[in-house]
């Protein structure tokens, strides 16, 4: 089938296009090109007769067309008007006609665009701005760039007019940016110069600096005012409501007490028509005022809160000093001073941080001290302590228990017996107790300020007969020559005598044995393996006595220097070598052997059958006690002689 291909399809103005013919039939008489989608004599461009090779221009010929023998048509120096359809009319030798249509599009080289704006000086939070990309060009695509980035997504940004217009609603100072537009068609792309959006804003509330408001007589007062504003604000100063000057800075040398008052900075933006003011109160002291301490937290909670203590007033060019407990500040990571030393911050306060705290202002002659400030640190309650510590009572006596827990404010106490609330007092008193008063006695301490509660439980036993005591130990496996062991006879009972026996004998006299806590506690210092004995404690009062079960002390020791047996060191070739290693140790040690430094086996016995002189060397036994963390070793030299070379040699085992 006869077809026309346009090369290229999108043609730039001024370039050329080739209408390339495919599948041209055989045996042709000639062909003709027409502008448009049909054969129309008035729109003929050119005709060609094959027999004469004669090309004849038609009414639509522009002088820019060239026809080739293969029927293709080249159009040079393309103009916009050339856009559209072209029809090839082929006349075959048998006078049967055939037609095909092709097309191309002509695009201009785009002009450089420019941006027009409907508002050159929009006001923040009030105006909208519409940017339009000029000129309006047919078949062009429009794009926008802000600070060389594609447009951000924002409900305040809107594209319209085929993306040719970019509208910014309710402009803000952040819209001050570089805006560019880009135009595109298939053959060119152009970009405008940037337009900087000049958003008028402010003035914001002015800031007066420096911030300090207290001055000494004789100093210079130099106040500066700044307000964010576009265009820059115009400034005016008022003192006590009276206009002073129209400058950004206010300077008054050698001030006196009479210069105290309210200082107002007014910022004015002539373009937005807005005014904003800020007032600061300046106090001029005839002499440095007595300082005082302010705190950001009057009741800090222990381990939770930080406290910032500030020395007032703030005075320019002043040295601030601090004292805690009448001492200069200790070095502590929890104490931080501000750059000007005016604020002392206590990080994560503790009950020990109560103070007192003093600050001082240093002048030429002396240091003025503030009154001391005590911090009221809320803490606790800690775990309550129930006293006395006895747990065993005889019937008929009075039970008087007292509870105490460190707390600020002081704790509120409650007593419970076997989980049942009894009374809300610090002390619990029960007269003439019986066995029925035995049970679990709980003291609950509550801090109403922190909301924290802590409890302690004590088991009270009321019995005429003393119970069978038991021994508790603070170290179940002490290491020889290193640890001490404290045995305590339980329970603690009122009006009771405590006794001790070792291996069924009364305590030997020894500087390493010490009784304490009313003989209730027996301490063995620097234990040895010989202390591994049976310990028994006994309790007695006027009506009964009782003994504990024995407790055997398990002393960890060793390993001592090992012994290798048999002691022989000379052997005959062919004998069996059977060495056994032993070391005193608790627990039993781990054994290992090395021959000439080379590790062998982890056994207590080393056996080598039919030794030869090759087995000469050093035989080392290594012992290790994992519980004590200690090691030991011994080395033995073994000599193996060839059979019959020397008399008196051992035959081995």
């Amino acid at each position: 089938k006869l077809t026309i291909e346009s090369t290229p399809f999108n043609v730039a103005e001024g370039k050329e296009v080739l209408l390339l013919v495919h599948n041209l039939p055989q045996h042709l008489f000639g062909y003709s090109w027409y502008k448009g989608e049909r054969v129309d004599g008035n729109r003929q461009i050119i005709g060609y007769v094959i027999g004469t090779q004669q090309a004849t221009p038609g009414p639509a010929y522009s002088g820019r067309e060239i026809i080739y023998p293969n029927a293709s048509l080249l159009i040079q120096n393309i103009i916009q008007n050339d856009t559209g359809f072209y029809t090839l009319h082929v006349i075959k030798s048998d006078l049967v006609n055939e037609e095909a249509t092709g097309q191309f599009r002509v695009y201009p080289e785009l002009p450089k665009p420019s941006i027009s704006s409907n508002n050159s000086k929009p006001v923040e939070d009030k105006d909208a701005v519409a940017f339009t990309c000029e000129p309006e060009t047919q078949d062009a695509t429009y794009l926008w760039w802000v600070n060389n980035q594609s447009l951000p997504v924002s409900p305040r940004l809107q594209l319209s007019n085929g993306n040719r217009t970019l509208t910014l609603f309710n402009v803000t100072r952040n819209d001050t940016a570089s805006y560019k537009c880009e135009t595109q068609n298939p053959v060119s792309a152009r970009r405008s110069d940037s337009v900087i959006l000049n958003v008028l804003y402010g003035p914001d509330a002015p800031t007066i600096s420096p911030l300090n408001t207290s001055y000494r007589s004789g100093e210079n007062l130099n106040l500066s005012c700044h307000a964010a504003s576009n265009p820059p604000a115009q400034y005016s100063w008022f003192v006590n409501g009276t206009f002073q000057q129209s400058t950004q800075e206010l300077f008054i040398p050698n001030i006196t007490v009479n210069n105290s008052g309210s200082y107002t900075c007014q910022a004015h933006n002539s373009d937005t028509g807005l005014n904003r003011t800020t007032v600061t109160t300046i106090t001029v002291y005839a002499e440095p005022p007595k300082p005082f301490i302010t705190s950001n937290n009057s009741n800090p909670v222990e381990d939770e809160d930080a406290v910032a203590l500030t020395c007032e007033p703030e005075i320019q060019n002043t040295t601030y000093l601090w004292w805690v407990n009448n001492q200069s500040l200790p070095v502590s990571p929890r104490l931080q001073l501000s750059n000007d030393n005016r604020t002392l911050t206590l990080l994560s306060v503790t009950r020990n941080d109560v103070g007192p705290y003093e600050c001082g202002i240093q002048n030429e002659l002396s240091v003025d001290h503030s009154d001391p400030v005590i911090l009221n640190v809320l803490y606790g309650p800690d775990d309550p302590t129930i006293s006395p510590s006895y747990t065993y009572y005889r019937p008929g006596v009075n039970l008087s228990l007292s509870c105490h827990a460190a707390s600020n404010p002081p704790a509120q106490y409650s007593w419970l017996i076997d989980g049942n609330i009894q009374q809300h007092t610090q002390e619990l008193f029960i007269s003439n107790i019986t066995e029925k008063n035995s049970g679990l006695y709980t003291c609950q301490a509550n801090n109403s300020a922190s909301g924290h509660s802590r409890t302690t439980v004590k088991t009270i036993t009321v019995s005429a007969e003393l119970p069978k005591p038991s021994i508790s130990s603070n170290n179940s496996k002490p290491v020889e020559d290193k640890d001490a062991v404290a045995f305590t006879c339980e329970p603690e009972a009122q009006n009771t005598t405590y006794l001790w026996w070792v291996n069924g004998q009364s305590l030997p006299v020894s500087p390493r044995l010490q009784l304490s806590n009313g003989n209730r506690t027996l301490t063995l210092f620097n234990v040895t393996r010989n202390d591994a004995r049976a310990y028994v404690c006994g309790i007695q009062n006027s009506v009964s006595a009782n003994r504990s079960d024995p407790v055997t002390l398990d002393v960890l020791y060793g390993p001592d220097t090992p012994i290798i047996s048999p002691p022989d060191s000379s052997y005959l070739s062919g004998a069996n070598l059977n060495l056994s290693c032993h070391s005193a140790s608790n627990p039993s040690p781990q054994y290992s052997w090395r021959i000439n430094g080379i590790p062998q086996q982890h056994t207590q016995v080393l056996f080598i059958a039919k030794i030869t002189p090759n087995n000469n060397g050093t035989y080392a036994c290594f012992v290790s006690n994992l519980a004590t963390g200690r090691n030991n070793s011994i080395v033995k030299s073994i000599t193996v002689s060839a059979s019959g070379t020397s008399p008196g040699l051992s035959a081995g085992a």
């Epitope: 730039a12 060389n148 060119s188 792309a189 152009r190 970009r191």
Partner: nanobody
């Protein structure tokens, strides 16, 4: 102003591929549209391909359409030309060009040019 240095040229057999690079320095790369042009011995400078500032628009000469691909990496300040199915008639000195306001096939629209890199397609 922007400085341009082309690289990646060389000798390649017909049907083979090459990737040309153009490294830019001296100015913000993304503010320039870029183009590739070529000049064979004894011939006029010829447009090859162009790309706009953001990389979303490209334009090719009819003779290379479908075989060559132009791309840019603004983070690396580099322009690329991937050339596939190379033909002997692609032999030329290849130039990189830059413009702050124009992207297209007209060499007069580009004020900044590199020194060129030679591509030879021969068996």
């Amino acid at each position: 102003e922007v400085q341009l240095v082309e690289s990646g040229g060389g000798v390649v057999q017909p049907g083979g591929s090459l990737r040309l690079s153009c490294a830019a320095s001296g100015h913000t790369f993304s503010e320039y549209a870029l183009g590739w042009f070529r000049q064979a011995p004894g011939k006029e400078r010829e447009f090859v391909a162009a790309i706009n500032w953001g990389g979303g628009w490209t334009y090719y000469a009819d003779s290379v359409e479908g075989r060559f691909t132009i791309s840019r990496d603004n983070a690396k300040n580099t322009l690329y030309l991937q050339m596939n199915s190379l033909r002997p008639e692609d032999t030329a000195l290849y130039y990189c060009a830059a413009s702050s306001d124009y992207a297209g096939g007209n060499p007069t629209g580009y004020p900044y040019w590199g020194q060129g890199t030679l591509v030879t397609v021969s068996s």
